[in-house]
């Protein structure tokens, strides 16, 4: 999906209002310095691409993020503020239902959510070039 035409400010507002708090809840008990952020993004569409990938694509050691509250709210925000996004996700959602697993918060998942926080931070606060 091409995130270029999303309403970035509305997604930012959704993140600051709710999604960020869910990420904090997920990371509770973890020091913010525990993980080194290595995933970066260059602009807002790229950030959303990386955020979608880390949030919804199962990775080795962390297969369970898509059912977390922050993930569901992320999905809702993208569906509302990115034209045509929800249509692209129908097949992915059906595939996910088939492989639903018990939620387990692994260290790998905590590290992945720490990376997500860094991506969201970058998405929210791109350095604005002055014209």
């Amino acid at each position: 999906y091409d995130f270029t035409n999303c309403d970035f400010e509305k997604i930012k507002a959704a993140y600051l209002s709710t999604i960020s708090k869910d990420l904090i809840t997920y990371m509770s008990g973890t020091k913010s310095t525990e993980f080194n952020n290595t995933v970066s993004c260059s602009n807002r569409p790229h950030c959303l691409t990386e955020i979608q990938s880390l949030t919804f694509n199962p990775t080795a050691g962390c297969a369970s993020l898509a059912k977390e509250m922050f993930a569901m709210k992320t999905k809702a925000a993208l569906a509302i503020w990115c034209p045509g996004y929800s249509e692209t996700q129908i097949n992915a959602t059906q595939a996910m239902k088939k492989r639903r697993k018990r939620k387990v918060t692994t260290n790998k998942c905590l590290e992945q959510v720490s990376q997500l926080q860094g991506l969201w931070r970058r998405f929210n606060r791109p350095l604005l070039k002055q014209q």
């Epitope: 509305k10 600051l16 209002s17 913010s32 310095t33 931070r121 970058r122 929210n124 604005l128």
Partner: antibody
Framework: EVQLVQSGAEVKKPGSSVKVSCKAS????????MHWVRQAPGQGLEWMGA????????SYNQKFKDRVTITADKSTSTAYMELSSLRSEDTAVYYC?????????????WGQGTTVTVSS | DIVMTQSPDSLAVSLGERATINCRAS??????????MHWYQQKPGQPPKLLLY???NLGSGIPDRFSGSGSGTDFTLTISSLQAEDVAVYYC?????????FGQGTKLEIK
């Protein structure tokens, strides 16, 4: 706990340049915007510019655009602010500051400040 | 540039009394329903310290006698019951538009 430690006080001649460093410790450096703010004696706060160390992208206050250069060295977790063509009005305390964890945009960690005096 | 104007420039309030500082932006600092306005406290010889973010949210470790309100262009910082340690200069800051700008500061003293 994240800390920002700045270089020591400087006394400079008008027309010269000064380069102030800001070393971060105790946390991730590359994925946080780092800002520079100055405060002239008895005056308020003035934003100079910022850098995203992850890719070196910068944003400057147009007031300083031709005189200020902000850089970062990821390998040493250090940000730098260089101000050229110094004049007496540049006498101030220069602070580096890091944005918060959540992308709210507030400055939650500050350096101790570096006093730069410009005098002939 | 967005100009931030604080009032008053200085304020003297008795211990235990309410202190109110206003900040007006030359244009709205709101975006998508959120106000991108922060408040800082600065004591002599120290860097500023965050008090409130996004107009009304308390910073970490800030006592609840501090509160903030407002949206658009007009914002208020209130200290419900002034304590001796609240003597400082207070600054508002907008981050909605580059360049980021601060108010000129309000000096709060004890009467």
């Amino acid at each position: 706990e994240v800390q920002l430690v700045q270089s020591g006080a400087e006394v400079k001649k008008p027309g010269s340049s000064v380069k102030v460093s800001c070393k971060a410790s105790g946390g991730t450096f590359s994925t946080y915007n780092m800002h520079w703010v100055r405060q002239a004696p008895g005056q308020g706060l003035e934003w100079m510019g910022a850098i995203y160390p992850g890719n070196g992208e910068t944003s400057y206050n147009q007031k300083f655009k031709d005189r200020v250069t902000i850089t970062a060295d990821k390998s040493t977790s250090t940000a730098y602010m260089e101000l050229s063509s110094l004049r007496s009005e540049d006498t101030a305390v220069y602070y580096c500051a890091r944005e918060d964890d959540y992308g709210e945009g507030y400055f939650d960690v500050w350096g101790q400040g570096t006093t730069v005096t410009v005098s002939s | 540039d967005i100009v931030m104007t604080q009032s008053p420039d200085s304020l003297a309030v008795s211990l235990g009394e309410r202190a109110t500082i206003n900040c007006r932006a030359s244009e709205s600092v709101d975006n998508s329903g959120l106000s991108f306005m922060h408040w800082y406290q600065q004591k002599p010889g120290q860097p500023p310290k965050l008090l409130l973010y996004r107009a009304s949210n308390l910073g970490s470790g800030i006592p609840d006698r501090f509160s903030g309100s407002g949206s658009g262009t007009d914002f208020t910082l209130t200290i419900s019951s002034l304590q001796a340690e609240d003597v400082a200069v207070y600054y508002c800051q907008q981050i909605n538009t580059d360049p980021l700008t601060f108010g000129q500061g309000t000096k709060l003293e004890i009467k």
